[in-house]
Interface confidence: medium
Amino acid sequence: PEPPTACREKQYLINSQCCSLCQPGQKLVSDCTEFTETECLPCGESEFLDTWNRETHCHQHKYCDPNLGLRVQQKGTSETDTICTCEEGWHCTSEACESCVLHRSCSPGFGVKQIATGVSDTICEPCPVGFFSNVSSAFEKCHPWTSCETKDLVVQQAGTNKTDVVCGPQDRLRA
């Protein structure tokens, strides 16, 4: 018979012959022959192959380096790679999450518009008139100035985007 020019799914062509691919989690040891099946071996510890393959070496699981703010979100298996995520207070620097950076804090005069997540940084906004923030924080929003009137007091010192108003007693001597 004519040697095949194409093979079925989960097979590969070698030496004019269709051999079975190794299943996920296994690597190729030797190609099939007329008389023998493809020989495959399971990947070792900390290794994986996630497709039907003819690879002679398994891939190393990704290392979630704590020095880069990473931790394991999901442990790898012989068929899947390790998935990393960021420690609390950190977020990924890329979609692949190869390293993390600390969440940014909003400086005094700025408040948090959106709290950071594992994949996005803190979004800050300037405190508008009538609001202030006197701390550097990754969580605090701008706070409204104290309303002196509701406390039967008067404004002694005007507020800024970084400081609250200072209230004081009404001047009783004034007519």
């Epitope: 290392y63 380096d65 704590p66 020095n67 703010g69 999901q74 420690e87």
Partner: antibody, heavy 121, light 106 residues
Framework: EVQLVESGGGLVQPGGSLRLSCAAS????????MSWVRQAPGKGLEWVST????????YYADSVKGRFTISRDNSKNTLYLQMNSLRAEDTAVYYC??????????????WGQGTTVTVSS | SYELTQPPSVSVSPGQTASITCSGD??????AAWYQQKPGQSPVLVIY???RRPSGIPERFSGSNSGNTATLTISGTQAMDEADYYC?????????FGGGTKLTVL
């Protein structure tokens, strides 16, 4: 030979302060995260704090947060633990430990001999 | 906060197999490590990444971790294995140790 040697322990009154040091040798200190672990008399191991290799990230147990500060000087191959507002329950042997990195995943593969901290009036 | 639970004590006859368990919520999703500590000595790492043995640790020490339980197994237990054993895992920016298990070789 990979070695960690702690120092700085001693007797201190409640409310007092103490600074522990851990001198590292035999490995590239700046490549590894480092931790402090303590053990109260007759009790089990309790994690205290961990610092990343470059010092950018620090992690603390709730029991010491706000009172203890971990730091490191990679030029001196030394790890520190500044302990303030000490309490009787901080009495323990304090161990310095090296995080295993990619060779000993999420484990502490080298430990010091420990230094004893006693908080008592 | 995350907790790891170990039996306070386990007894075994010489030559027999000792199993020490460590349980925690979805512990199988984390990497577990085990330490041996003899009286007056510092802890020694005996198992890391659930089941791997550091160089110099005898083959009789093995580990597994799935579901909610990690297990340290010592086959052909020897008198020199008598010690306290602690499991450990990283859990969301904190390191957690189990309470420890005293292994007595009868």
């Amino acid at each position: 030979e990979v070695q960690l040697v702690e120092s700085g322990g001693g007797l201190v009154q409640p409310g007092g302060s103490l600074r522990l040091s851990c001198a590292a040798s035999g490995f590239t200190f700046s490549s590894y995260a480092m931790s402090w672990v303590r053990q109260a008399p007759g009790k089990g191991l309790e994690w205290v704090s961990t610092i990343q290799n470059a010092g950018g990230g620090t992690y603390y147990a709730d029991s010491v947060k706000g009172r203890f500060t971990i730091s490191r000087d990679n030029s001196k191959n030394t790890l520190y633990l500044q302990m303030n507002s000490l309490r009787a329950e901080d009495t323990a042997v304090y161990y310095c430990a090296k995080e295993g990195g990619k060779y000993y995943y999420y484990a502490m593969d080298v430990w010091g001999q420990g230094t004893t901290v006693t908080v008592s009036s | 906060s995350y907790e790891l639970t170990q039996p306070p004590s386990v007894s075994v006859s010489p030559g027999q197999t000792a199993s020490i368990t460590c349980s925690g919520d979805k512990l199988g999703d984390k990497y577990a490590a085990w330490y041996q500590q003899k009286p007056g000595q510092s802890p020694v790492l005996v198992i890391y990444q659930d089941s791997r043995r550091p160089s110099g640790i005898p083959e009789r020490f093995s580990g597994s971790n799935s579901g909610n339980t990690a297990t340290l197994t010592i086959s052909g237990t020897q008198a020199m294995d008598e010690a306290d054993y602690y499991c450990q895992a990283w859990a969301s920016s904190t390191v957690v140790f189990g309470g420890g298990t005293k292994l007595t070789v009868l």
